[in-house]
Interface confidence: low
């Protein structure tokens, strides 16, 4: 079989920029490094058939199936997909290998299946088979990581039971507060499951896979810090592991730490201590309280005390199922056109929520910030002064929550007019919603001061796009006003706007807009 060409099959993943269906050529896109698909000779097959490793692709992802042929002379080729022939344009790379590509842009269900590539070289004919399927992301999960003590070692293992297998990393920070933000230079990341250095100020473990990233912070009481204005609270669901770290620094080793639950010492096997000397020769002690699987009776005040520091407590609450607590009554806001303003929702939730802000069917990313009192807050400031309905939605594994906001922007009315053979209508979206007057312009009233009250119909309608209100006023045409100029005026506390309409026979109507402040 020495005549057989040396072939290589690769998969190239692209970052999407475009949309199309199978293009049998090279296509300019941003690509990731190629993945070798193996291309092994298929045994017991009639003819020479190579089979590439199966390819799983996310919906809407873009890929290139590529074959590199190391054979002398020219080659010709043909792609076949679902009994249809697709054009094939081989070219040669710098190493003089024949290169054949099939680009699949924005993968859909219809593009999944078997792609057959027939190649004819001067020496031989052969077939290459690619099987492309859509990845079943319905089976995907991303679970919040949790901690376990490593057997016979003073170390923590971080576990996230997720599909596909997640990448686990520890996120460590040794400074206080704001400087421990994710991208801060004070933050150190370690891509490993086991952590031995447990003395840091802030310790988190994060797991990430195709569904995103979830993190769990090691709950810590620092006896050298002033207690918060409200007692720190830790929620857990029945069956989850409990980990609380108590940390204290003292000038020498002459101090000890103890954990108590509701004034009773924790049982042996529910805590372990570690100590080390810091760079300035002070002693750091940490004492972990842990329960491998919590029950309702593990609820209570956990107090860490020291012979040399004021004790501090945390309230651990064990719940049967997760929750989201917040007031869901709708809120209306009225602001000026250039006033700075943010919507905000304050909530208490466990497990941590995923949330979105929505306006006009467009979703915006949602950021959460933990407050000292156990509550979290999400703010939305990116409304660009667009009036309408804004929705905050939050959910976790056990609960969901929705809150509606209405934003009204105070502004002078702007009037638009239209007319038909039988009536004239004016529209305005100013706020507060305007009131209307109609006036007739005649020889007797050249300044259009003669008010029309007959045949006027006002209404308020919801403009669906933004959920904002539009006010309209319609004047039914009567013989008394036909052929005259009429003026509709919308006014509110910020000003008045008018439009003048000539009521004549059907046809295009001239409109003259007046702006009266």
């Amino acid at each position: 079989n020495q005549d057989l060409p040396v072939i290589k099959c690769v998969l190239i993943n692209h970052k999407n920029n475009d949309s199309s269906v199978g293009k049998s050529s090279s296509y300019p896109m941003v690509s990731e490094s190629p993945e070798d698909l193996g291309c092994a000779l298929r045994p017991q097959s009639s003819g020479t058939v190579y089979e590439a490793a199966a390819v799983e692709v996310d919906v809407s992802a873009s890929i290139t199936l590529q074959v590199l042929v190391d054979a002398p002379g020219n080659i010709s080729c043909l792609w076949v997909f679902k009994h249809s022939s697709l054009n094939c344009q081989p070219h040669f790379d710098l190493q003089n290998r024949g290169v054949v590509s099939m680009v699949i842009l924005k993968m859909t269900e219809t593009q999944a299946g078997e792609y057959l590539l027939f190649i004819q070289s001067e020496a031989t004919n052969y077939t290459i088979l690619f099987t492309v399927s859509i990845r079943n992301t319905l089976l995907y999960t991303l679970r919040r990581p949790y901690f376990r003590k490593m057997e016979n070692q003073d170390a923590l293992v971080c576990i996230s039971e997720s599909v596909p297998e997640p990448i686990v990393e520890w996120v460590l920070c040794d400074s206080q507060g704001e400087s421990c933000k994710e991208e801060s230079p004070a933050v150190v990341k370690k891509e490993e499951k086991v952590l031995h250095e447990l003395f840091g100020t802030d310790i988190r473990c994060c797991a990430r896979n195709e569904l995103g990233r979830e993190c769990t912070r090691l709950f810590t009481i620092d006896l050298n810090q002033t207690p918060q204005t409200t007692l720190p609270q830790l929620f857990l669901k029945v069956g989850e592991p409990l980990w609380i770290r108590c940390k204290a620094v003292h000038v020498n080793h002459g101090f000890g730490l103890t954990w108590e639950l509701e004034n009773k010492a924790l049982e042996e096997g529910n805590y372990f201590e570690m100590s080390t000397y810091s760079t300035n020769r002070t002693m750091i002690r940490i004492l972990f309280a842990f329960v491998s699987s919590v029950a309702r009776n593990d609820t209570g005040y956990y107090t860490c005390s020291s012979s040399k520091h004021p004790s501090q407590s945390a309230l651990v609450t064990i719940v049967e199922k997760g929750f989201i607590n917040a007031t869901n009554s709708s809120e209306d806001y009225e602001i000026d056109q250039y006033e700075e303003f943010c919507f905000s929702v304050r909530f208490k939730a466990y497990p941590q929520i995923r949330c979105t802000w929505t306006f006009s069917r467009k979703s915006f990313p949602c950021e959460q910030k933990g407050l000292d009192n156990g509550y979290s807050i999400s703010k939305f400031c990116n409304h660009k002064h667009q009036p309408g309905e804004y929705i905050f939605h939050a959910e976790n594994d056990d609960a969901q929550f929705t809150k509606m906001f209405t934003l009204n922007i105070r502004r002078k009315p702007q009037v638009l007019a239209e007319a038909s053979a039988s009536q004239a209508s004016c529209f305005s979206d100013g706020y507060p919603l305007p009131s209307w007057t109609w006036k007739k312009c005649s020889d007797k009233s050249p300044n259009c001061t003669e008010e029309i009250t007959e045949g006027v119909w006002n209404r308020k309608a919801n403009r669906k796009v933004f959920g904002q209100w539009v006010s309209s006023s319609t004047l039914n045409m009567s013989e008394a006003i036909k052929g005259f100029l009429v003026k509709c005026c919308a006014y509110n506390s910020l000003g008045t706007s008018c439009e003048t309409i000539l009521l004549n026979s059907p046809g295009p109507f001239p409109f003259i807009q007046d702006n009266i402040s």
Epitope: P227, T230, N263, T303
Partner: nanobody
Framework: QVQLQESGGGLVQAGGSLRLSCAAS????????MNWYRQAPGKQRESVAW???????NYADSVQGRFTISRDNAKNTVYLQMDNLKPEDTAVYYC?????WGQGTQVTVSS
């Protein structure tokens, strides 16, 4: 919900004494630790002393031997007896327990 109310602060000359009281709205007998903190202008809030339900006490080095903390569970009150006061003891003194803070009482020591 525990509410704490401090009293007894005031202006005193160096070397003088004051007795601060912290009255709790509910029973403190089940509360294990009662604390006094203080905050001087422009400084962090710091621990001064604490007392456990069994009566054991602990003091910051700077007040050791001059201040005495005590509690009366029947009256739901904690006390801080401050003797031989120094100008550096000038601060707002706060009572604290289990996540609850009082409003604070001002102590000013003049030289």
């Amino acid at each position: 919900q525990v509410q704490l109310q401090e009293s007894g602060g005031g202006l005193v000359q160096a070397g003088g004494s004051l007795r601060l009281s912290c009255a709790a709205s509910g029973s403190i007998s089940s509360i294990r630790y009662m604390n006094w903190y203080r905050q001087a202008p422009g400084k962090q809030r710091e621990s001064v002393a604490w007392i456990t339900s069994s009566g054991s006490t602990n003091y910051a080095d700077s007040v050791q031997g001059r201040f005495t903390i005590s509690r009366d569970n029947a009256k739901n009150t904690v006390y801080l007896q401050m003797d031989n006061l120094k100008p550096e003891d000038t601060a707002v003194y706060y009572c604290y327990t289990m996540g609850y803070w009082g409003q604070g009482t001002q102590v000013t020591v003049s030289s």
